[in-house]
Amino acid sequence: WELTILHTNDVHSRLEQTSEDSSKCVNASRCMGGVARLFTKVQQIRRAEPNVLLLDAGDQYQGTIWFTVYKGAEVAHFMNALRYDAMALGNHEFDNGVEGLIEPLLKEAKFPILSANIKAKGPLASQISGLYLPYKVLPVGDEVVGIVGYTSKETPFLSNPGTNLVFEDEITALQPEVDKLKTLNVNKIIALGHSGFETDKLIAQKVRGVDVVVGGHSNTFLYTGNPPSKEVPAGKYPFIVTSDDGRKVPVVQAYAFGKYLGYLKIEFDERGNVISSHGNPILLNSSIPEDPSIKADINKWRIKLDNYSTQELGKTIVYLDGSSQSCRFRECNMGNLICDAMINNNLRHADEMFWNHVSMCILNGGGIRSPIDERNNGTITWENLAAVLPFGGTFDLVQLKGSTLKKAFEHSVHRYGQSTGEFLQVGGIHVVYDLSRKPGDRVVKLDVLCTKCRVPSYDPLKMDEIYKVILPNFLANGGDGFQMIKDELLRHDSGDQDINVVSTYISKMKVIYPAVEGRIK
């Protein structure tokens, strides 16, 4: 019995087609992805093949103005239109709190939304009961397939799930649910979830009875043969894991941003064994036409976005200096504003020991593309912020050793004075450079704000300590020559859309007046 699994993950609000790098579409003939194009391909496959499932492995939320404005209603609407069969909860589905998940998505989705390792407690338990499920048995042709969901147990550190959701270990939580499916005589089981490729592989290895793992979170690109675009494969598609009980379990993921549609064909025998598995992600490029009815719907929903981008978010009473003449040479108040917003966006999980889980921010000065003049009545709009941060990136959470941070700050000034983008703006960090010293030895003082303290204060950076840092995904991926970050990071979790982080902060503060205050000397 042959099953075709179509899958997406980490779409991050890319409802409209995008450029090849998943930023705003400029030249339509070269654009990719988007729900209208995805629908065309999905329908083509549904017509051609008998047993098809369309699955999403989480993180539909967060990433463009679509999410900022529609707050998840757009996800429910267009996923319903595409007739998704199931979705797993990702960490970003909790970005607007549990209410921001329940109302727009859980209550509106016409497909099951899954996670076996999220347990509700207290007053939330009855409120959310039945709105998401640990598993769902889906009829497919003459057969049934069990889908069991999972979500990163790091979600409380990455998003805002509140205090009434407990995120259990994925493997511990999945095993009893898979066992339950087996007792229901369901012998074809897909684990669909959002914990990253390493955890996906562990699930394939450790959870008895899981036949296929469809993952997300790590934006992993797998491909067999010559890849069709710029993404470099992390392995073959599917990636085969040998389970502890001796079975070959295919593991798949489909990069991110709706650029590809994962396409996996599985042949099962009567016992539910995977006899063969093959496929590849399908690049959703302009050779696939956008479906006209979905496209018309997108255009209808778009109108509200254009109105939103000119509305006032808040006011500034000072000039926001985002000029390259400042931000690539010295501390600039636009850099301070953005870093403060980045830390503020990650305020969560205080306890008796820690006032917050992260206190530090770094930001390449070259990523700040425009100032904002306060003389326009002080008004700040989304449009203004899009000029400052035009690349459509995210502000991510990484874990780095102190020694890596020290290398990053040396790189920041290794060719100082040439107006290059690698000069770092900071938050929760005090750095002193001596530019008379030779490159690679210019950082003379590097103090960082403590997190394990009731009164935050600056302490010298310890080379062997592991620190959490918020930074642009561009830096996490080694951009502007920060190869040491990419090579040495110990953990990397994708965060929220950059403009959204700053706009939310400005809306919260209402009036802002960031200063140059001696963070960089």
Partner: antibody, heavy 114, light 107 residues
């Protein structure tokens, strides 16, 4: 649990035909196909062909084409294998086996003797 | 048709021995290979499917490996109940074909 139960032993004369049945249970019968395999006394296994239950599609080994007919009765989840123009070398145990031979019938002995 | 050449055709071994049986295909069959066990009474049982996946209930002393045209069944420590005849089967292309069998006997 998958189970395949075959019909009883048959003794046939050369030139005659034999029809062996295989009743399946414990799985979604229409979603899969069934194989027929035979084993002559003291010999190895020989694949004869397969039938897809849902559509009745068949694929026969060239060696048996024209002599073998595989059919299906979906209402009783039963597959049949008929072999015609029997000769002495068709004396063998005939097995039905699920799609990728994960489960086997108990075998049906067919003896061709004058 | 794809020919499957199985070797050895028979072998004698003692309990606890490591036993290796090989199947060579006349052309590349990908991973499309099963290993079957037939006990003297005639009952057939699949041990390994898709070259290396172990059927449920099959002891972990059985393992399969290989690719392309060369495939191997290994019994890491032979047990009394393992004395039987073993067959490989390729299902990469029609007609499916079996190896000639390997009879494992008590030394």
């Amino acid at each position: 649990e998958v189970q395949l139960v075959q019909s009883g032993a048959e003794v046939k004369k050369p030139g005659a035909s034999v029809k062996v049945s295989c009743k399946a249970s414990g799985y979604t019968f229409t979603a899969y196909f069934m194989n027929w395999v035979r084993q002559a006394p003291g010999q190895g296994l020989e694949w004869m062909g397969r039938i897809y239950h849902n559509k009745g599609d068949t694929f026969y080994s060239q060696k048996f084409k024209g002599r073998v007919t595989m059919t299906v009765d979906k209402s009783t989840s039963t597959v049949y294998m008929e072999l015609s123009s029997l000769r002495s070398e068709d004396t063998a145990v005939y097995y039905c086996a699920t799609s990728y031979v994960g489960d086997w019938g108990q075998g049906t002995t067919v003896t061709v003797s004058s | 048709d794809i020919q499957m050449t199985q070797s050895p055709s028979s072998l004698s071994a003692s309990v606890g021995d490591r036993v290796t049986i090989t199947c060579r295909a006349s052309q590349d069959i990908g991973d499309s290979l099963n290993w079957l066990q037939q006990k003297p009474g005639g009952a057939l049982k699949r041990l390994i499917y898709a070259t290396s996946s172990l059927d449920s209930g099959v002891p972990s002393r059985f393992s399969g490996s290989g690719s392309g045209t060369e495939y191997t069944l290994t019994i890491s420590s032979l047990q009394p109940e393992d004395f039987a005849t073993y067959y490989c089967l390729q299902y990469a292309s029609f007609p499916w074909t079996f190896g000639g069998g390997t009879k494992v006997e008590i030394k």
